[in-house]
């Protein structure tokens, strides 16, 4: 089976690299822009020059392109606790990001949100905290893994997982009860 | 307004080196690329070499592997490192915002004697 290709790929494959086909003659292989520029005018003819125009401030292209118009630079989102690490320029992209001892939870290909590192209190890191996954922890006895918190065994409720973690307590609670009884 | 000014043109021997510097102000510099051109006698102007902002370059296939781009975002400098130089290298060579931008230095002379 042949992939579907769209038209702008179709027609990107007829010429080498770095050339697209003119929209109106496809016998004219015309230059691609640099990435920071846009296409203003396709080349007059063959072995013409394209003419490419800079990008305004607050608008990029970050690779080599026939765009009509440079993209919008992105804004970094603060009510998701993201922190710009490099300002938009004419040919890449802000570059948004988490504070130190934070870290990248992403609800969809595109958005993430910060959050701070877990401490593994009552614990021990595992796994470092990195850009895109929270510290990995390990607990101590008497303690059971919850939400990626060490939690008193006290906490643990008969029905939950952590039943096999803090058995010993489970049985002490139950055993206390039991002794209560007439 | 935009200023772009060359220097470190002049006379040279074939094979030998030159620096030219271009410095650069009326706006921030981090945020463009930057690029060389040249124009010899009677030729069209053509582009030697470009930098992006973070740092990639590219080069004519005419002096790959002897010229080399660089750009100081502190001192708002971009460079251009010519080595085993050419007679046919000869001309006067151009500092621009980016590849395409209207604005341009005055120009600087090369001239490489055989």
């Known amino acids: 089976l042949v992939p579907h290709l769209g038209d702008r790929e179709k027609r990107d494959s007829v010429c080498p690299q770095g050339k697209y086909i003119h929209p109106q003659n496809n016998s004219i292989c015309c230059t691609k822009c640099h990435k920071g520029t846009y296409l203003y005018n396709d080349c007059p003819g063959p072995g013409q020059d394209t003419d490419c125009r800079e990008c305004e401030s607050g608008s990029f292209t970050a690779s080599e392109n026939h765009l009509r118009h440079c993209l919008s630079c992105s804004k970094c989102r603060k009510e998701m606790g993201q922190v710009e690490i490099s300002s938009c320029t004419v040919d890449r992209d802000t570059v948004c990001g988490c504070r130190k001892n934070q870290y990248r939870h992403y609800w969809s290909e595109n958005l993430f949100q910060c959050f701070n590192c877990s401490l593994c209190l009552n614990g021990t890191v595992h796994l470092s905290c990195q850009e895109k996954q929270n510290t990995v922890c390990t607990c101590h006895a008497g303690f059971f893994l919850r939400e990626n918190e060490c939690v008193s065994c006290s906490n643990c409720k008969k029905s939950l997982e952590c039943t096999k973690l803090c058995l010993p307590q489970i049985e002490n609670v139950k055993g206390t009860e039991d002794s209560g009884t007439t | 307004q935009v200023q772009l000014q060359e220097s470190g043109g002049g006379l040279v021997q074939s094979g030998g080196s030159l620096r030219l510097s271009c410095r650069a102000s009326g706006f921030t510099f981090s945020h463009y690329p930057m690029s060389w051109y040249r124009q010899a006698p009677g030729k069209k102007r053509e582009l030697v070499a470009g930098i992006y902002t973070d740092g990639s370059t590219n080069y004519a296939d005419s002096v790959k592997g002897r010229f080399t781009i660089s750009r100081d975002n502190a001192k708002n400098t971009v460079y251009l490192q010519m080595s085993s130089l050419k007679p046919e290298d000869t001309a006067v060579y151009y500092c621009?915002?980016?590849?395409?931008?209207?604005?341009w230095g005055q120009g600087t002379q090369v001239t490489v004697s055989s």
């Open positions: 621009r915002r980016s590849m395409v931008s209207v604005y």
